[in-house]
């Protein structure tokens, strides 16, 4: 089959209460079949590209864990498995703060180097 | 050929702790994850956790982060599952799995024989 | 976390004859299912992942399918060594969930 292109598949929007949980759904499609090198999954809050990061977390050669090195305030959990193309985050205790636009990138290292970032993100609305 | 072999059978009293060892052979340990997966007397598999040998790093299912901690040894290629304060919904056979690849899938491909924890006043 | 329910709880079936478990998963998974089978005082034992490919020296009458938050396991001609229970298991979300299991017997 033909190699599937970069793609992110993210809802325009996502909608909460606050002090309630809310889950940023992020799936993708990338050329690379059969990737099993290091890979780095990033959200990141304001602006695609240069918002700052709230989570980060990286899976080693071979690994399905995706060791967490950023969670902002500790309320940021990845619930999809980047192995299985899905970067779905849950944040937790909602704020009136966390009322923005949220944007998923991924990151191959090792023999591929390559990355991609959602445009668009997913608004989350805290009412 | 690969082989996931644990400790023995326990008996523990409510609020102790456990530790479950396995020792992994035939194959390179640090490369692969290992996850710990409970299943009680005639009940479904739970997911526990998961490590990876290579890094230490590991991460858990919700429900038992706060009793559960996973370890390993890569001296001895053996990975540990601790489970504290013990109570009687604990009482499972407790197996350990190793997370195989192949052309970019992952699935459990060997398990070890499993170690029943009795929990019992 | 994501629930996997299998029906039929269990499944009796004619020697030769075909057994179809499904399970059903509470959101999309992709097709990030694997399949397992386990025997009385044994550890499961991996049949199929990602939904359709056979495990290395599983037979072939063991064959699956489904995508999304549909899956079917099938046995296309039962033997009595496939006496078991047969669980799925989804892998796209963590934490792993796994179905409540699917007992097949002999008729």
């Known amino acids: 089959s033909p190699a599937q292109r970069w793609s992110m598949q993210v809802p325009p929007e996502v909608s909460a209460e606050a002090g309630d949980a809310a889950v940023l759904p992020c799936t993708f499609t990338h050329p690379h079949r059969h990737y099993d090198g290091p890979l780095t999954a990033i959200w990141r809050a304001g602006e695609p590209y240069a918002g700052p990061q709230v989570f980060r977390c990286a899976a080693a050669r071979g690994s399905e864990l995706c060791q967490t090195a950023l969670s902002l305030h500790g309320r940021f959990r990845l619930l999809g498995n980047p192995r299985r193309n899905d970067l779905s985050l849950r944040v937790e205790r909602l704020a009136l703060a966390d009322d923005r636009r949220y944007f998923c990138r991924v990151e191959f290292a090792g023999d591929v180097h390559d990355r991609y970032e959602s445009r668009h993100g997913v608004r989350l609305h805290v009412t | 050929q690969v082989q996931l072999v644990q400790s023995g059978a326990e008996v523990k009293k409510p609020g102790a702790s456990v530790k479950v060892s396995c020792k992994a052979s035939g194959y390179t340990f640090p490369r692969y994850d290992v996850s710990w997966i409970r299943q009680a007397p005639g009940q479904g598999l739970e997911w526990i956790g998961v490590i990876h040998p290579g890094s230490g790093g590991t991460g858990y299912n919700e429900k038992f982060k706060a009793r559960a901690t996973i370890t390993v040894d890569t001296s001895t290629s053996t990975a540990y599952m601790e489970l504290s304060s013990l109570r009687s919904e604990d009482t499972a056979v407790y197996y350990c799995?190793?997370?195989?690849?192949?052309?970019?899938?992952?699935?459990?491909?060997?398990w070890g024989q499993g170690t029943l924890v009795t929990v019992s006043s | 976390d994501i629930v996997m329910t299998q029906s039929p709880d269990s499944l009796a079936v004619s020697l030769g004859e075909r057994a179809t478990i499904n399970c059903k998963a509470s959101?999309?998974?992709?097709?990030?299912v694997d399949w397992y089978q386990q025997k009385p005082g044994q550890p499961p034992k991996l049949l199929i992942y990602e939904s359709t490919n056979r495990y290395t020296g599983v037979p072939d009458r063991f064959s699956g399918s489904g995508s999304g938050t549909d899956f079917t396991l099938t046995i296309s001609s039962l033997q009595a060594e496939d006496v078991a229970v047969y669980y799925c298991?989804?892998?796209?979300?963590?934490?792993?969930?796994f179905g409540q299991g699917t007992k097949v017997e002999i008729k």
């Open positions: 298991m989804q892998s796209n979300f963590f934490p792993f969930t």
């Open positions: 959101q999309n998974v992709g097709s990030n």
């Open positions: 799995a190793r997370r195989g690849l192949n052309s970019g899938y992952w699935f459990f491909d060997f």
